[in-house]
Structure formats: structure tokens, C-alpha cells
């Protein structure tokens, strides 16, 4: 998608993004916050998928480690966090069932911010 | 996971997340840039299992729709933008091809700034 | 030209409300924060209440903390600030003023008087 | 709380004579510290912001100085439109913003 960089744009948070393979996931949290397995393959009507993720994550070398980019600092504290996002992958639960879940993965980096009371 | 509203945090761009059906959907991107038809169901094991997906954006209707929430307006212009990540999905192509490829979805709404040139 | 125009002042008997509002023009609003003043008959000057320019931070002297409410609609250029609980010390001409990103102001308006008695 | 002490409270000056005010902090406010001028039935006006910088329109006649706690108003030949009260008020550390309690510049 467009990177807006290179349009002049600044994001408020830095953020990193790569695959994930289920072999480097190995466990992901369920939509009911159990921990599941998640399978390194898939099977398809012609043999077998890897599974794997496209995951984004707020940058721990970036800029914004220490606070998001371009905040009123009079007013606000500020925190770059990472935030979740569900999408389905073929798991096996603690009970070795084995089953298409929602688990949570990391999808964005998002500013959060606190009123700063009184200084 | 947990509210940051409930921590007294505040977003810097107000968000709204929904379940979205194939049947809603339609249609998607792939990675190649390519429009595909995002099938309503997909075979399992014990039969089918229905297509959907959890997708978050820009709130239209929120505060920040104006720009982002405690940004520096000195120097900065602000905007907040759905991004866009990757989940596979069993779609079909303008070829009538089936398979699994990984389609864009919205999954967050973030703030992006541009530099003020003088006031 | 930038200009302040405060109205909504007024004799109110002790426990009782009012709301103050100061439309703003000649300047974009929302790009500044806004706050009030107030000044008792022959006294100084005493700072009351300020918000930033999205509505979100707001701040109040401990006299106004709990019985004030500072708020604005940036789509009409207007503060408004809520008295509640109001008291005779409270009587008092009120201003409204634009405040520079250091927080000193730099546009009054005119005052709006309020009368606390019974 | 930063609390702003203005002294003197009356200065009875000729037109023409030099005013020297003064406005001293409970703590350090750096030159976060901004002076302004008030008329009977007036609202107060912006003369000075940062200590020392005057504000849009004003005479070179008013000046400011100082940093940290202690600060001057110096308005170096009184002319009669500027018999008010001058009031300092700092904006380092808030909330509050505090004002000092104000000279009274009178004719003498």
C-alpha cells in the first residue's frame, strides 16, 4: 500500500512489520485468552499451506520508544502501543483438539495518550 | 484485550471494529494489487466453515475525524487513516481461479502528520 | 481583527447557575487554547479555568474545581464556562481570553459581569 | 503554587519621570513571565511575554527584564495614557496560572 512517507507524511508511531511463520509463532492467545497451538501447515485440496502472518508492531529502535511523534507535550502523556487484531489460523488447544480458531496477533502501532494533571 | 479507556487513556485517532462477512465483502485486493472474489465458505474437515473477518477503522463519526487528538498545531498537520494488513482468505480470481491468497483488510486507524510551513 | 465577546453574566442568588459563553473570531479557533479570568470588585486578577484547543485538557483553579465547567464548541467558535453552586465571592467581572502555546494571553475580551447575591 | 508578589502597590509618578516595577516569584519561573496593563473599565492588555519580548503595537517605551524569581516592568518616560494598574503574571508551572496582585501607577 502507498507509503506515506512518501508523500511528506510522518506516522505519530514508528512501527515494524514482517511474517510470521506458525513455526516462530508456535502458541497465540484464543478469542477466549487461552493459549493455543498454532499449526505449521494447513491442508488444502492440493497437499499442504504454511501457515504464516502478516504482523505489525510498534518499533522498540524507533524514535517513538519514548513517546508518539508530535504531541502536545503541555497537555499529554504519551505511549506507543503495539494493538491486536484476530484472524483465523488452524490451531490445537491445550485439550489436543484441533480446530480453525481467531487467535490475536499484532497488527498496528497506535499513540495513546494520558492528560497530564497538574505539573 | 483491555480498554485504555478504562486506564484513563485516550486514543489519538477514535477507531470502530467490526465482523465482516464474505457475503459484506464481496470483493478484496490481493498482494498483487489484483481485485479477487472473497468466497463465502470454505470446505473443512466436517464441512464448511463461513468467512469473515475482524476489521477495525477511522471512526467517521468520532472526534478525531477533523485530525488527530493531542497533536502540537503549531507545527504540525494532522490526519487519521485506516491502515491496511494481510490475512489469507480463499478467494477467486478474474480467471475463476480458487485459492488461498492474502488479501488487504483493514485493521487500524493511525495518525499520520505533516510539518506546518510557517503560521 | 481578533475579537473576544463574552455574554451570559447576570445576578444570581447564592446556590444558583449560570453560563457564561465568548464568541471568537478573526483567528482559527480551534488551532488555540482558551481560558478564563476573573477580577472581584477592586481586586486583581485571578486565573479560573483553561482548555486546550481540542476540548480534551482542562484545567481549574482550586476555587473553581468541582463547581465550574469549562467547554467549547470549536464549530461555533464559542467557550462557554458552566458555574454551578455559585457563592457571593464568586461575584466577579469574567474574561475571556486567547491564550498563546506558552500559556501567557494575548487577547481579552471585554467582561461579562456576575452578581452573586440574594 | 507559584505565588507572585508585586511591589510597590502604589508608585506615584510625573509624566515624563522613569517607572521602575517589579514582580518577584516564590520559585524559579525562568522567563516564563508576561506583563500586562489595565485601565478603569477595561479589560487587561498583553504589553510583555518571555520577561523581556513587548508584544504587537506596543511603545518602545515599556520594557521588561529579568529571569527566575525576580523581574522589572521599566517604562522609561510615563506618558498620561499609561496611569493603570500593570499586573505580572507567570505561566512556567501550572496549573495554576498566578497572577501578582498589581502596581497601581498613579499621577503624582
Known amino acids: 500500500h502507498s507509503d506515506p512517507a512518501r508523500r511528506g507524511e510522518l506516522s505519530v508511531c514508528d512501527s515494524i512489520s514482517e511474517w510470521v511463520t506458525a513455526a516462530d509463532k508456535k502458541t497465540a492467545v484464543d478469542m477466549s485468552g487461552g493459549t493455543v497451538t498454532v499449526l505449521e501447515k494447513v491442508p488444502v485440496s492440493k497437499g499442504q499451506l504454511k501457515q504464516y502472518f502478516y504482523e505489525t508492531k510498534c518499533n522498540p529502535m524507533g524514535y517513538t520508544k519514548e513517546g508518539c511523534r508530535g504531541i502536545d507535550k503541555r497537555h499529554w502523556n504519551s505511549q506507543c502501543r503495539t494493538t491486536q487484531s484476530y484472524v483465523r489460523a488452524l490451531t490445537m488447544d491445550s485439550k489436543k483438539r484441533i480446530g480453525w480458531r481467531f487467535i490475536r496477533i499484532d497488527t498496528s502501532c497506535v499513540c495513546t495518550l494520558t492528560i497530564k494533571r497538574g505539573r | 484485550h483491555s480498554d485504555p479507556a478504562r486506564r484513563g487513556e485516550l486514543s489519538v485517532c477514535d477507531s470502530i471494529s467490526e465482523w465482516v462477512t464474505a457475503a459484506d465483502k464481496k470483493t478484496a485486493v490481493d498482494m498483487s494489487g489484483g481485485t479477487v472474489t472473497v468466497l463465502e465458505k470454505v470446505p473443512v474437515s466436517k464441512g464448511q466453515l463461513k468467512q469473515y473477518f475482524y476489521e477495525t477503522k477511522c471512526n467517521p463519526m468520532g472526534y478525531t475525524k477533523e485530525g488527530c487528538r493531542g497533536i502540537d498545531k503549531r507545527h504540525w498537520n494532522s490526519q487519521c487513516r485506516t491502515t491496511q494488513s494481510y490475512v489469507r482468505a480463499l478467494t477467486m480470481d478474474s480467471k475463476k481461479r480458487i485459492g488461498w491468497r492474502f488479501i488487504r483488510i483493514d485493521t487500524s486507524c493511525v495518525c499520520t502528520l505533516t510539518i506546518k510551513r510557517g503560521r | 481583527e481578533v475579537q473576544l465577546l463574552e455574554s451570559g453574566g447576570g445576578l444570581v442568588p447564592p446556590g444558583g447557575s449560570l453560563r457564561l459563553s465568548c464568541a471568537a473570531s478573526?483567528?482559527?479557533?480551534?488551532?488555540?487554547?482558551m481560558g478564563w479570568v476573573r477580577q472581584a470588585p477592586g481586586k486583581g486578577l485571578e486565573w479560573v479555568s483553561a482548555?486546550?484547543?481540542?476540548?480534551?485538557?482542562?484545567y481549574y483553579a482550586d476555587s473553581a474545581k468541582g463547581r465550574f465547567t469549562i467547554s467549547r464548541d470549536n464549530s461555533k467558535n464559542t467557550l462557554y464556562l458552566q458555574m454551578n453552586s455559585l457563592r457571593a465571592e464568586d461575584t466577579a467581572v469574567y474574561y475571556c481570553?486567547?491564550?498563546?502555546?506558552?500559556?501567557?494571553?494575548?487577547?481579552w475580551g471585554q467582561g461579562t459581569t456576575v452578581t452573586v447575591s440574594s | 503554587e507559584i505565588v507572585m508578589t508585586q511591589s510597590p502597590a502604589v508608585l506615584s509618578v510625573s509624566p515624563g519621570d522613569r517607572a521602575t516595577l517589579s514582580c518577584r516569584a516564590s520559585?524559579?519561573?525562568?522567563?516564563?513571565l508576561a506583563w500586562y496593563q489595565q485601565k478603569p473599565g477595561q479589560p487587561p492588555r498583553l504589553l510583555i511575554y518571555?520577561?523581556?519580548t513587548r508584544a504587537t503595537g506596543i511603545p518602545a517605551r515599556f520594557s521588561g527584564s529579568g529571569s527566575g524569581t525576580d523581574f522589572t516592568l521599566t517604562i522609561s518616560s510615563l506618558q498620561s495614557e499609561d496611569f493603570a494598574v500593570y499586573y505580572c503574571?507567570?505561566?512556567?508551572?501550572?496549573?495554576?496560572?498566578?497572577f501578582g496582585g498589581g502596581t497601581k501607577v498613579e499621577i503624582k
Open positions: 481570553a486567547k491564550l498563546d502555546y506558552y500559556y501567557y494571553m494575548d487577547v
Open positions: 478573526g483567528f482559527i479557533f480551534d488551532d488555540y487554547d
Open positions: 482548555i486546550d484547543h481540542g476540548g480534551y485538557a482542562r
Open positions: 520559585q524559579s519561573v525562568d522567563i516564563k
Open positions: 518571555d520577561a523581556s
Open positions: 503574571q507567570q505561566y512556567d508551572d501550572w496549573p495554576p496560572l498566578t
